[in-house]
């Protein structure tokens, strides 16, 4: 269909770099969530930081082009980086409206296909550009 | 600050492939926008022929995507449209423009092209 | 494709006229309440000009008197007091849908 994607926007504090260039910030009537209309995709993706007792959403927003896991109707996450010991980024790419505003289910830590905690490190910012 | 400007042949022979290139001053292409083509034939509106956006990926019109072609040179901070088996009806006025958004805010000075023999 | 019918073709006015130009769409230019038309100005031999995006956003350094409005399918370009630098062919473009599609036009004649 020709019509273009909106996904949910969100970059948490402290995040380097921004996707927002990837789409056009929506007035959405409310301040959060955010809306975003994608420019260059038909998908949306969202990080979350997963530790010990809670996940986090990190960053939301329009991928940069069309890829394996776009046509996923919804948000399921897989395990992508170590932004510091006992902390997991699990990522996600779908391709319907607003489908990244939350994850499906995410493993719990330490399960079977989540990194070993002994992988590599990353510094906060560098490991969610090594996620997306 | 942001100029785009068009080269290329003015005439092209029908049956022929049209080339086009655009040079971007004041910015580089891999740092964000989109890189379009917009063509208008002689007093009538205008057509978008499709972009190349900042990462490499692109769009075309339906109604060309059998016959145009959108490349870049990020070395020389251009790119290019390429058309095949034109006619006359492809003779126009082509414009390159960059988009930050979806919508036009910076336009070559355009180029007329002429399809004839 | 979405279609953009522009109204009138072409019209003549006198400095200090208000003008409406209007831009109707074959369907719906909307998204989540967003409307993604814009419209542009083109004089003879020159490129267009953007003076408004996103229905009713003027474009930085263009005058006050171009304001837009409209939703969904109907649109509005007014130019609130005719400028001797205003008599030039104005055009809308829908961004709503792929492909991006222009209206065909009206051109603001001195009577």
């Known amino acids: 269909p020709p019509n273009r994607r909106t996904c949910v926007f969100f970059e948490a504090p402290g995040v380097r770099g921004s996707t927002k260039t990837l789409g056009e910030l929506l007035d959405t009537g409310t301040e959060l969530p955010r809306a975003i209309r994608c420019l260059y995709s038909r998908c949306c993706f969202g990080i979350w930081n997963l530790t010990q007792d809670r996940a986090q959403v990190e960053m939301q927003g329009c991928r940069d082009s069309d890829e394996p896991g776009c046509e996923s109707l919804h948000c399921d996450p897989s395990p992508r980086a170590h932004p510091s010991p006992g902390s997991t980024l699990f990522t996600c790419s779908c391709g319907t409206d607003f489908c990244n505003a939350n994850y499906s289910h995410l493993p719990p830590p330490g399960s079977p296909g989540t990194p070993g905690s002994q992988g590599p490190q990353a510094a906060p910012g560098e490991s969610i550009w090594m996620a997306l | 600050q942001l100029q785009l400007q068009e080269s290329g042949p003015g005439l092209v022979k029908p049956s022929e492939t049209l080339s086009l290139t655009c040079t971007v001053s004041g910015y580089s292409i891999t740092s964000d926008f989109a890189w379009n083509w917009i063509r208008q034939p002689p007093g009538k509106g205008l057509e978008w022929m499709g972009y190349?956006?900042?990462?490499?990926?692109?769009s075309y019109n339906p109604s060309l995507k059998s016959r145009v072609t959108i490349s870049r040179d990020t070395s020389k901070n251009q790119f290019s449209l390429k058309l095949s088996s034109v006619t006359a009806a492809d003779t126009a006025v082509y414009y390159c423009a960059g988009s930050r958004y979806s919508w036009f805010a910076y336009w070559g000075q355009g180029t007329l092209v002429t399809v004839s023999s | 494709d979405i279609q953009l019918t522009q109204s009138p073709s072409s019209l003549s006015a006198s400095v200090g006229d208000r003008v409406t130009i209007t831009c109707r769409a074959s369907?719906?230019?909307?998204?989540?309440?967003?409307?993604?038309m814009h419209w542009y100005q083109q004089k003879p031999g020159k490129p267009p000009k953007l003076l408004i995006y996103r229905a009713s956003n003027l474009e930085s350094g263009i005058p006050s008197r171009f304001s837009g409005s409209g939703s969904g399918t109907d649109f509005t370009l007014t130019i609130s007091s005719l400028q001797p630098e205003d008599f030039a062919t104005y055009y809308c473009?829908?961004?709503?849908?792929?492909?991006?599609?222009f209206g065909g036009g009206t051109k603001v004649e001195i009577k």
């Open positions: 369907e719906s230019v909307d998204t989540y309440g967003n409307s993604f």
């Open positions: 190349i956006s900042f990462s490499g990926s692109t």
């Open positions: 473009q829908q961004s709503n849908e792929d492909p991006y599609t």
